[in-house]
């Protein structure tokens, strides 16, 4: 399970339309459910239930986005519509270039993602937890445009990180 180096760029905007760019670095892990490769794209927050809709019309949302899914405690969703792996697959079907799961509330999901599928996804499936997950969700919850760059080696140049 290799380390995934995730660089998140947030575009803060003022009411006048001016904007400032903030970059935050965090680490996660590449799971065996997906490929260990780099990916980047605009962050799209997906609710776990939002990935349940099996409407064929919605099988392609956009291209090249990074899905962020905060998994809930298993007891809050005792009969999930899809496994965690199924949710990752559904996101990729809908155009995600990568999926990042916040597993802080559901650490069992780590084992599910690392069971090793015979047919792993061709896109990275990363999981984050703890302080890294908090950093990521703080940015996502700002509801501004944000981008994620996932790399399987540390960024070449030291980035100036802003504490969000």
């Amino acid at each position: 399970k290799e380390t995934a180096f995730v660089e998140v760029v947030l575009f803060e905007s003022s009411p006048s339309g001016d904007y400032t760019t903030y970059t935050t670095g965090l680490t996660g892990r590449f799971s065996r459910a997906g490929a260990t490769l780099s990916a980047e794209g605009e962050i799209v927050q997906m609710h776990p239930l939002g990935l349940c809709n099996n409407n064929d019309e919605e099988d392609l949302y956009e291209y090249g986005w990074v899905g962020v899914v905060k998994l809930e405690q298993p007891e809050l969703d005792p009969k999930p519509c899809l496994t965690v792996l199924g949710k990752a697959k559904r996101a990729v079907q809908r155009g995600a270039t990568a999926v990042i799961f916040d597993v802080s509330e559901n650490p069992e999901a780590i084992d599910q993602l690392n069971q090793g599928s015979e047919d792993p996804l061709k896109r990275p499936v990363v999981y984050v937890k703890g302080a890294d997950a908090i950093k990521l969700m703080n940015i996502v919850n700002k509801q501004k445009v944000a981008r994620a760059r996932i790399q399987h080696r540390p960024p070449r140049q030291p980035t100036e990180y802003f504490d969000m």
Epitope: F11, G17, Y19, T21, E40, N53, Y61, W65
Partner: antibody, heavy 114, light 107 residues
């Protein structure tokens, strides 16, 4: 099938206002950034505005900053562009698009002329 | 602001030709480059995203490539339906900027 249908275009005098709408269907509108792009007659494409999925982030080029306002109503799956202090150079077809520009509406023509 | 310098502005070509259109970015834009095709009276159509990936339904004769700050759209075995104006777009940072367009026309 993803559909984006713009409306609200028309002839307007310089200095006046106009509000464009874009009705979206066929995808989870509330999850995605949306944008407006315009094209003056016989000219190229120009990005006009983008708005984040929840509406908290709005972004504009200098050419429209302070005059145009992008907004959205996720409950109605509708995107808006409020255009104030219109100028003759704002004459263009205005397209609504998903934030990554994978899907576009058919466009609505805005003519600013006295 | 990031400038996208697109060339050529006009490209006469014959059916069956291999043609290449280039956009040069004034700053680093990573893979945040998309190519669009627009036919008269129609909305733009996404052809390439992420600089090199083909959008759904786009024929395989289209391809995108990158060399440093130069991004190229190549069409192999040109067909009459490919005659259109092509635009590049950088969406690495705001303000997003389009190239000026390349009109592909029959010789």
């Amino acid at each position: 099938e993803v559909q984006l249908v713009e409306s609200g275009g028309g002839l307007v005098q310089p200095g006046r206002s106009l509000k464009l709408s874009c009705a979206a269907s066929g995808f989870t509108f509330s999850s995605f950034t949306m944008a407006w792009v315009r094209q003056a007659p016989k000219k190229g494409l120009e990005w006009v505005a983008s708005i984040s999925s929840g509406g908290g982030g709005t972004y504009y080029p200098d050419s429209v900053k302070g005059r145009f306002t992008i907004s959205r109503d996720n409950a109605k799956s509708t995107l808006y562009l409020q255009m104030d202090s219109l100028r003759s150079e704002d004459t263009a077809s205005y397209y609504c698009a998903t934030g990554g520009f994978a899907y576009w509406g058919q466009g609505t023509l805005v003519i600013v002329s006295s | 602001d990031i400038q996208m310098t697109q060339s050529p502005s006009s490209l006469p070509a014959s059916l069956g030709d291999r043609v290449t259109i280039t956009c040069r970015a004034s700053q680093d834009i990573g893979s945040y480059l998309r190519w669009f095709q627009q036919k008269p009276g129609k909305s733009p159509r996404l052809m390439i995203y992420g600089a090199t990936s083909l959008a759904n339904g786009v024929p395989s004769r289209f391809s995108g490539s990158r060399s440093g700050s130069d991004y190229s759209l190549t069409i192999n075995n040109l067909e009459s339906e490919d005659m259109a104006i092509y635009y590049c777009l950088q969406h690495n940072e705001f303000p997003y900027t389009f190239g000026t367009g390349t009109k592909l026309e029959l010789k």
